[in-house]
């Protein structure tokens, strides 16, 4: 059930990424490390890289508040699972700086893609049942 709650958190992060994609023109255009084709057992490490990236508002007025709120929520850590803790200490996972840097639009698309992949893996590996807590 704890793992389910964690995946529901991933599900929520996808919505926040979608919200930010609506404001991509109001984001600072700086290129950011954007993991792609993440190797097995390094997914949590890659998510940590996405969360650490310096995504920020371009400070262009109207949408600044919602953008900053969304970025803050994206970066908020949820309680770690055992798998997550193990991965963060794996020396074999690439460092954040080693990933190709991409502009905000592609950065957000790759983040969403990884989150969806993790939900897919979780739901595909589960036995029959519900997401109730």
């Amino acid at each position: 059930q704890g793992q389910d709650r964690h995946m529901i958190r991933m599900r929520q992060l996808i919505d926040i990424v979608d919200q930010l994609k609506n404001y991509v023109n109001d984001l600072d255009p700086e290129f950011l490390p954007a993991p792609e084709d993440v190797e097995t057992n390094c997914e949590w490490s890659a998510i940590s890289c996405f969360q650490k990236a310096q995504l920020k508002s371009a400070n262009t007025g109207n949408n600044e508040r919602i953008i900053n709120l969304s970025i803050k929520k994206l970066k908020r850590k949820s309680p770690s699972t055992g798998a997550e803790r193990r991965q963060k200490h794996r020396l074999t996972c690439p460092s954040c700086d080693s990933y190709e840097k991409k502009p905000p639009k592609e950065f957000l698309e790759r983040f969403k893609s990884l989150l969806q992949k993790m939900i897919h893996q979780h739901l595909s590996s589960r036995t029959h049942g519900s997401e109730d807590s």
Epitope: M7, R11, Q12, L123, E131, D132, S133
Partner: antibody, heavy 116, light 107 residues
Framework: QVQLVQSGAEVKKPGASVKVSCKAS????????MHWVRQAPGQGLEWMGT????????IYSQNFKGRVTMTRDTSTSTVYMELSSLRSEDTAVYYC?????????WGQGTLVTVSS | DIQLTQSPSSLSASVGDRVTITCRAS??????LNWYQQKPGKAVKLLIY???RLHSGVPSRFSGSGSGTDYTLTISSLQPEDFATYYC?????????FGGGTKVEIK
């Protein structure tokens, strides 16, 4: 068990506002986002937006932006949806729905009638 | 926005029939497709999430399948309590969108 209980039917005049409540029980209120969906008479379902009860972060459908406000009261595990500048086309049943991997539990619905 | 087209919009069937409802998305939604049942005056119920996962308490006669843009809800043997309207909904991209619904009526 999970339960979402909504406030009763409302009749409003055009231009007025309506505030619908949705009281949650049977789970940890702040763990799940709450979505609002409406259904006009004889029509399908239309998504209005969502709120994270842990911090009141909201995402609204462009169709309702500027007219809808979603809030929450953690002390009573209640979410609210307020719709302003009502027009006749807003006559509908309004539903709250908890979102896990899907809208897994729904309120019974609140009929809002907009009529002069 | 992602459009969902449900077909048929209505169908007549008898108890015991096998019923299939389809939902086509305007773009790939990567299995983030859910199915709901609505009866007049009752709360909407989730039947299936993520294409094929049965929600708790839902009878096994309901099943879902599909991928990419095309998805299906099947009721293997229609029961009297299954006469209702069914909606698909995509959870891939905001805004959340629903299909137009399929009303299953008694023949």
């Amino acid at each position: 068990q999970v339960q979402l209980v909504q406030s009763g039917a409302e009749v409003k005049k055009p231009g007025a506002s309506v505030k619908v409540s949705c009281k949650a029980s049977g789970y940890t209120f702040t763990d799940y986002w709450m979505h609002w969906v409406r259904q006009a008479p004889g029509q399908g379902l239309e998504w209005m937006g969502t709120i994270d009860p842990s911090d009141q972060y909201t995402i609204y459908s462009q169709n309702f932006k500027g007219r809808v406000t979603m809030t929450r009261d953690t002390s009573t595990s209640t979410v609210y949806m307020e719709l302003s500048s009502l027009r006749s086309e807003d006559t509908a049943v309004y539903y709250c729905a908890r979102y896990g991997f899907a809208m897994d539990y729904w309120g019974q619905g609140t009929l809002v009638t907009v009529s002069s | 926005d992602i459009q969902l087209t449900q077909s048929p919009s209505s169908l007549s069937a008898s108890v015991g029939d096998r019923v299939t409802i389809t939902c086509r998305a305007s773009q790939d939604i990567s299995n983030f497709l859910n199915w709901y049942q609505q009866k007049p005056g009752k709360a909407v119920k989730l039947l299936i999430y993520y294409t094929s996962r049965l929600h708790s308490g839902v009878p096994s006669r309901f099943s879902g399948s599909g991928s990419g843009t095309d998805y299906t809800l099947t009721i293997s043997s229609l029961q009297p309590e299954d006469f209702a309207t069914y909606y698909c909904q995509q959870g891939h991209t905001l805004p959340r969108t629903f299909g137009g619904g399929t009303k299953v009526e008694i023949k």
